[in-house]
Structures are given as C-alpha cells and as structure tokens.
C-alpha cells in the first residue's frame, strides 16, 4: 500500500441567467484551496428552464417561479448534498426585465418577489434576485471571456504569476432584447457612463462598455416587422413563399416598437404579411435601425453614443455566435471577412421559403428570421461599431471557452463571491494531485 493524496474539495456556485426569452442555470465549481487563482473556476453543469423568460410571466408571477423548479431540482442532484448550504445562488435578470421594469414596474417587482420566494425554499445560500444594468451585463461578459481565456494572469513555469502580454479581449454580446460591446481602452471615455475601472489581480483596467436596449435580436426582429407593416405591406427580409398572419397587438406591445405604433391602431386586428426575399430592401430596412445624424462627442457608434475606435481582438457570443454559426454550418457559407459576412447575409436573403426549408430540413419556423438576423449582425458590426476588414479579422465567434458558456453569468459570480481578488497573488507552490 501507499499513501494516496486526496484531491482537494470542490466548491460550487449557481447563477440563474434570466434572459428576455429564456432562463438558463449555470453551476460552477472550483477547488476550495485555489479560490484566488485564475482560470480555476469552470462550468460543472447547466440547465435550460422550459418556457419563456421570467418577464413573460408579468401577468402570472408565480408561473415565473414555478418554471425554475425543474432546474433547481437538478441543482440539488448536481451539487453534492454536503455542499448545498455553502453554495451561493444568484439570479440576475437582463434586458427583458429591464423593459418590463420600464413599462410595468409593479409587475417587474412582483416577478422578482415570486422568484425570490421560490429560491429561498432551496437549501442553497441564496444571495438575491435582481435586474442587472446594461453596464453590468457588458462588463461581466468581458470578465467571463478574459477569465476563461486566462488573459488577466497566468501561472508561469517558474512558479510565478504573470500578466500575459497578449492583452485582453473585447466582448460583444447579442441577447434577445439588448446588445453589449465592452473592450479595454487606453484613453478616458468622453462619456463617463461608458467607462468602468476594474482592479483585478493587482492590475488596473480601463474598460469601455455600452449596452443598447432594444437592439437584441428578438427586439430588432420585432422592430423590423413593425417597419415592414408600416412601409411595405410585405416583409423584404422574410423569404418569398413565407405567409403569416400578424396580430397588431403582438407587434406593438413592446416598448421597443412603441415609436412605430400607429396612432389609432386596433390591437386585435390581424394583418396578412408575406415575405419577398429582397436583400437590398432588407438592408435598407435594417439600416433604419441606426441613426448617425448627430454625435455630441468626438466620435460615436450610433444613436449619438460615444465609442472609442474598436481595438484589439474580440469574442462575439450568444446570438452573434448563433447567427454566424447558422451561416457557416447550416448554409455552408464562408464568413471569415466582413465582405463574406455581407455576401452570406445577401445569400440567405435571396432564398425562398422552399429553398430554405430544403437547406435546413425540419419545419423550423424561425428559419424565416435568419436573413434579418444576419443582415443586422453585419450592419451592427460594420456600420454600428465601426469594424473594418482588419479589425473584423480579430473577431472570433464563440459559444464556449474551456467548456464553459461565455456570457455574463460567470463574471457575475466571480465578482460577487470575490473569486477575483483586487490584489496580486503572492508566490505559491503548486501541489500535483494527479
């Protein structure tokens, strides 16, 4: 016999990412004896909550909390019983709830209260359910990406911690109701609201971040539908051969389409609308989402929002990834350059409904949205954020890094559980448990 060194105990943390269209639960784990190390926290498991996002339960708050039960029950199994009490549990809600909070603050409060009531029934260390600001959503996504890719700090072969020379990655998140862009800059922001100062592992980071509410994929699609109803009587971004009936109340009930709402419209009226597979008209329709007319700063992205020039490499995740992945994988189109991305969007927008269905077997109703989605991503990156061909070459579209989903959830937990210290780590000796 010989002495066998037991591997260190693991700690766990749970984050419920309550997005506009659905909720996801992420369970993270890390060795208890290496809490302050970098790249140590990883995803243990995840669970997609069935049904819509919690904001869709405005009229039925208890339904929001009930929807979470299946995933919470899974968490009871995934986290060892002896670790339940010491496992922090957080719920963060994003743009769907920000929108609900704008239009119906009472309903928003009721949903959060109902969810809180259910989460406190579980044996975890529940630490609150709240709505994240757009700035937090952007910054925590940036922290997640750079933590997972070990851009903050690394353990060298000489037994020293050092800051990698490659610098940090910018982060771009395309959600259902908002989109965020976050990257490190050298000069101070002209708009203080867009700047965040971070101290991580003894290093100082000046980060630019902005969140555009109503520029998430789902809200953009809804706004384009409202525009098509107003200006065309057909939808240039939908495929020819795609025929729908639209209840006007569904189109105009979002705060994002309020500005397009006709003065005396009948919310229960149904309108027939068909697609026309017109890439050029679709591009024009998408262009109408961006305003470049005025900028109170030395430079802007769009809608008068300050943005320094994009610099360095970027990781684009969530719906950015899904859109580009559809073009690459389902359509077999190259998207390595901006020119190719535009050509791919035009290609999808030229397809008829029958052609699309033949390319992607199975009746996926949301196939009809990929033209608009691709056109929006292309326009947002090139015209909106100002990526040229050279800068676009530094953008990677990714869903996961180190087997962990890229999004704000991990960064949020790292921050709230102090897993990233502000001070630099000292010299450490590692123990090999292999």
């Amino acid at each position: 016999t010989r002495d066998v060194r037991e591997p260190p105990a693991l700690k766990y943390g749970i984050v419920l990412d309550a997005g506009s269209s659905h909720t996801s639960m992420f369970i993270y784990k890390w060795p208890a004896d290496k809490e302050n190390d970098t790249g140590i926290v990883g995803q243990h498991s995840s669970c997609d909550v069935p049904g819509g996002g919690i904001s869709s339960y405005a009229d039925n708050p208890s339904g929001a909390s009930q929807s979470l039960v299946g995933c919470l029950e899974q968490a009871l199994q995934d986290v060892p019983k002896e670790r339940h009490a010491g496992t922090p549990l957080y719920l963060g809600a994003t743009a769907g709830m920000r929108l609900l909070n704008l239009t119906n603050p009472e309903a928003s409060t009721s949903v959060l209260m109902a969810v809180t009531h259910t989460l406190t029934q579980y044996p975890f260390d529940f630490r609150g359910a709240r709505i994240l600001s757009g700035q937090e959503e952007g910054v925590f996504g940036w922290v997640t990406a750079n933590y997972l890719l070990e851009n903050f700090i690394k353990y060298g072969w000489v037994g020293r911690w050092f800051r990698p020379r490659k610098g940090t990655l910018g982060a771009m998140d395309l959600g259902g109701a908002s989109t965020q862009i976050t990257f490190e800059t050298t000069s101070p922001a002209e708009d203080r609201a867009s700047e965040v100062q971070l101290h991580l592992y003894g290093q100082h980071y000046r980060v630019y971040t902005h969140s555009f509410l109503c520029y998430g994929r789902d809200q953009v699609l809804q706004r384009l539908l409202a525009s098509a109803l107003q200006t065309h009587g057909f939808h240039p971004c939908w495929p020819r051969g795609f025929s729908t009936q639209v209840l006007l109340g569904d189109v105009y009930q979002s705060p994002c389409t309020m500005a397009q709402r006709p003065q005396n419209f009948n919310s229960s009226a149904r309108v027939s609308l068909s697609g026309s597979s017109d890439p050029h008209l679709c591009r024009d329709l998408v262009s109408g989402l961006f305003s470049f007319s005025s900028c109170p700063f030395s430079r802007c992205s769009f809608n008068g929002v300050f943005q320094p020039p994009v610099a360095g490499n970027f990781v684009a995740f969530s719906a950015f990834f899904y859109t580009v992945d559809f073009l690459r994988t389902s359509m077999g189109l190259p998207v390595a350059t901006l020119q190719q991305l535009e050509a791919a969007a035009v290609n999808v927008c030229n397809q008829t409904w029958a052609q699309l269905q033949a390319r992607v077997p199975g009746q996926r109703a949301r196939l009809a949205d990929y033209c608009a989605g691709a056109m929006f991503v292309q326009q947002l990156l090139s015209r909106g954020y100002g990526f040229d061909e050279r800068a676009f070459g530094g953008v990677i579209f990714q869903k996961k890094a180190a087997d962990t989903a890229v999004g704000w959830a991990l960064g949020y937990m790292l921050n709230l559980t102090n897993l990233i210290p502000a001070d630099p780590p000292g010299l450490r000796k590692g123990t090999d448990f292999s």
Epitope: S21, A354, Q363, A365
Partner: antibody, heavy 129, light 111 residues
Framework: QIQLQESGPGLVKPSQTLSLTCTVS?????????WNWIRQHPGKGLEWIGY???????NYNPSLKNRVTISRDTSKNQFSLKLSSVTAADTAVYYC??????????????????????WGQGTTVTVSS | ETVLTQSPATLSVSPGERATISCKAS??????????MNWYQQKPGQAPRLLIY???NLESGIPARFSGSGSGTDFTLTISSVEPEDAATYYC?????????FGGGTKLEIK
C-alpha cells in the same frame, strides 16, 4: 370569410388514383396561405398529407411523398390532390384546409406557429373493388 | 417524425366540472424558447377548428374556459368548467418540425 369545399368521387378502386378538388371562395389562393390536404382514417386521428403554397411551392408528408401530387388551378381558385396506387388503407375522410404561420409572442420573442384554421367539411373516400 | 400521444382516449365529465387532456410528444416541440403546439376541437360531423396555438395562446372567439399549458414534451388542454357544447374530440398538433403531426385524439363525453 374564407370558405373551402371538397369534391370528388366517393369510391375509388384499389391501385387507381384518388383525385379530389378543393374550391376556395372569399380569398384568392395566390394571395397568401398554404393550401393543405389532411385525412382522417375511420375512428382514427388526423394525418397531414401536404400543401401547395400561394407561391406554388409544394411540401409533402415524407410517408406519402412518392404517391402524392398537389396542384392548383388559379383561374378557378381551386387546388387538387392526386394520390396514386391507392389501397384500402387510404380509405378516409379527406379535408382541405387553409394554413399559415401565425405570428405570436412568447416572452419578448416573436415566433411563427403553423396553424390550419380554415377547413372544408370533408369528403369520404372509400377504396374498394 | 414527432409522434404525439394523447391521454385519456375518452374522458367523461359532468357539466361544470374541470376536464384535463394530456399530450406527450416523442421529442421536444420547443425551439428557441417557444412551444410549437396547437390544439383543435372537432365536433361530430364537423371539420376541426383551432382552439389554442403556441401551447397557451387562445384563438380569438374561443371561450376563456379553454386554456393550454406546457412546454418541451408535455402539454395540457384544460376546460375549467365543461359545458354541454364542449362534447367533441380534441387533437393536439405540433408544428416544430416537418411533417406537422397530430395526436390520436381525446373524445370528451358529457355525462
């Protein structure tokens, strides 16, 4: 108000071709919608056969694809079903129906749900020698 | 194809009582956070008519006593207080994937 009416022979011999026509009134079949055929075997559930779209595209149930043709005559505002090499298993009530993608909101996410909400009264077809 | 299994095959309920019909799919009919499930009512000698779409959205003109719920593979049609005219066969139908498929039907009898 859109109305649909099926017509065609009620008795077809085995191995022959079943032919049915659906006449649409109150709406032009080229303006929109998907024009479906659905059948219901005696005492059984419903089975979707296929459709022809307002744009003249076809979509068939893979289980029947080799035997089915759905076509249209725009001058008469009609669409037709032809089912070849019939057997007793094709005995059923045949319905024509108008369908489309209903836009609806789930959460803050709009999507499209294929529904068939204009139906004919159905016509019984018996396959027998 | 997606197979839909309805239960019970027959349901006998007194007027004013609650009726619950279940529909189970062989695979998830959810996509992107939405449930592609519809419910139809077919009265004897008549064509089916749409009651509910997207799992829980009531079609216009359908009485509020009808409601739908569920997601993934498990769906339910509920009639909160059955009335004599509700005697019919009820079908679930999925539109998530080609071909669209229907359940085998549940016959609702009024005692």
């Amino acid at each position: 108000q859109i109305q649909l009416q099926e017509s065609g022979p009620g008795l077809v011999k085995p191995s022959q071709t079943l032919s049915l026509t659906c006449t649409v009134s109150g709406y032009s079949i080229t303006s929109g919608y998907y024009w479906n055929w659905i059948r219901q075997h005696p005492g059984k559930g419903l089975e979707w056969i296929g459709y022809i779209s307002y744009d003249a595209d076809n979509n068939y149930n893979p289980s029947l694809k080799n035997r089915v043709t759905i076509s249209r005559d725009t001058s008469k505002n009609q669409f037709s079903l032809k089912l070849s090499s019939v057997t007793a298993a094709d005995t059923a009530v045949y319905y024509c129906a108008g369908g489309y993608y209903r836009y609806g909101l789930g959460s803050y996410r709009g999507s499209y749900y294929y529904v068939m909400d204009y139906w004919g009264q159905g016509t019984t077809v018996t396959v027998s020698s | 194809e997606t197979v839909l299994t309805q239960s019970p095959a027959t349901l006998s309920v007194s007027p004013g009582e609650r009726a619950t019909i279940s529909c189970k799919a062989s695979q998830s009919v959810d996509y992107d956070g939405n449930s592609y499930m519809n419910w139809y009512q077919q009265k004897p000698g008549q064509a089916p008519r749409l009651l509910i779409y997207a799992a829980s959205n009531l079609e216009s003109g359908i009485p509020a006593r009808f409601s739908g719920s569920g997601s993934g593979t498990d769906f339910t049609l509920t009639i909160s207080s059955v009335e004599p005219e509700d005697a019919a066969t009820y079908y679930c139908q999925q539109s998530n994937e080609d071909p669209p498929t229907f359940g085998g039907g549940t016959k609702l009898e009024i005692k």
